[in-house]
Interface confidence: low
Amino acid sequence: ASTGETPNLGEVVVAEVGWDALKLNWTAPEGAYEYFFIQVQEADTVEAAQNLTVPGGLRSTDLPGLKAATHYTITIRGVTQDFSTTPLSVEVLTASGLNDIFEAQKIEWHEGTHHHHHH
């Protein structure tokens, strides 16, 4: 078990949204996590979440295989060998057409408070 306190994630940003994919960026202290666990859940359905793990050195990933014009909740956790951070979530609506790309809302995490930033 770790002796020190593992810091939480900083912020998560949906950087790009397409009709069937999106790009997720996040911040985290360097070297704090072995990997990140990402769940992509279609909102308002009982469909199983899509799960993805990415190495702890990454701060960005593409999330393919989504449906167009659909609300998703994306949750990310930083994971060490014996610790998982508080989950950080962002909601996003995928684009309705192939060329409909926009920058989505940005959500920051500050000690249990969500701050919403619209661009």
Epitope: A1, E34, Y35, F37, Q39, A49, N51, T53, V54, P55, G56, V79, T80, Q81, D82, F83, S84
Partner: antibody, heavy 121, light 107 residues
């Protein structure tokens, strides 16, 4: 010291299912991924899938998708692998392995003793 | 899936020999590669992780190298207990894939 203890050998009929257990002791169970790896007689090692008990969600190799179910019971620190629609080519030693590193498909640093599953009519 | 091509598939060597086994990945996997030793009827045992880091308790005669697509496991001076089958494992991209194994036999 981490130990993974698997259930005993099984003999199954083609078309049936088998469920193998893997009980972990030592270390934290929930946050470590447990993978299942199989080895057919005289063959190499093959990753089947894995689970991180804290999340309860499993990940499977394409080859086994739809036929394998991996679960974990945090209360007993036990992971399970169930393989259905068994055929003769599923005859193998099945290992559970605890991972170090990147979740489901990290480098395996602790292994169970293996469970021999024989599929024969 | 990433293909891991391991060579040679078998080799004969004598105690004291220097032995090198190679693993080639079909695409770049950074340094996300481990090496395992397996003896008949036993579970595999990890020797090397992250391409070149020695697993705790493993003798220093074992060493790993490489990154990207080309990796090596070297046994600097083969000992009687080293006769076994060795596997590489890539864990950079899912699904994890093993090389087909290299059997090290006594000459």
């Amino acid at each position: 010291q981490v130990q993974l203890v698997q259930s005993g050998a099984e003999v199954k009929k083609p078309g049936s299912s088998v469920k193998v257990s893997c009980k972990a002791s030592g270390g934290t169970f929930s946050s470590y991924a447990i993978s299942w790896v199989r080895q057919a007689p005289g063959q190499g090692l093959e990753w089947m899938g894995g689970i991180i008990p804290i999340f309860g969600t499993a990940n499977y190799a394409q080859k086994f998708q739809g036929r394998v179910t991996i679960t974990a019971d945090k209360s007993t620190s036990t992971a399970y692998m169930e393989l259905s629609s068994l055929r003769s080519e599923d005859t193998a030693v099945y290992y559970c392995a605890r991972l170090y590193g990147y979740a489901y498909y990290g480098a395996f640093d602790y292994w169970g003793q293996g469970t021999t599953v024989t599929v024969s009519s | 899936d990433i293909q891991m091509t391991q060579s040679p598939s078998s080799l004969s060597a004598s105690v004291g020999d220097r032995v090198t086994i190679t693993c080639r990945a079909s695409q770049g996997i950074r340094n996300d590669l481990g090496w395992y030793q397996q003896k008949p009827g036993k579970a595999p045992k990890r020797l090397i992780y992250a391409a070149s880091s020695l697993q705790s308790g493993v003798p220093s005669r074992f060493s790993g190298g490489g990154s990207g697509t080309e990796f090596t496991l070297t046994i600097s001076s083969l000992q009687p207990e080293d006769f076994a089958t060795y596997y590489c494992l890539q864990n950079g991209l899912q699904p994890a894939t093993f090389g087909q194994g290299t059997k090290v036999e006594i000459k």
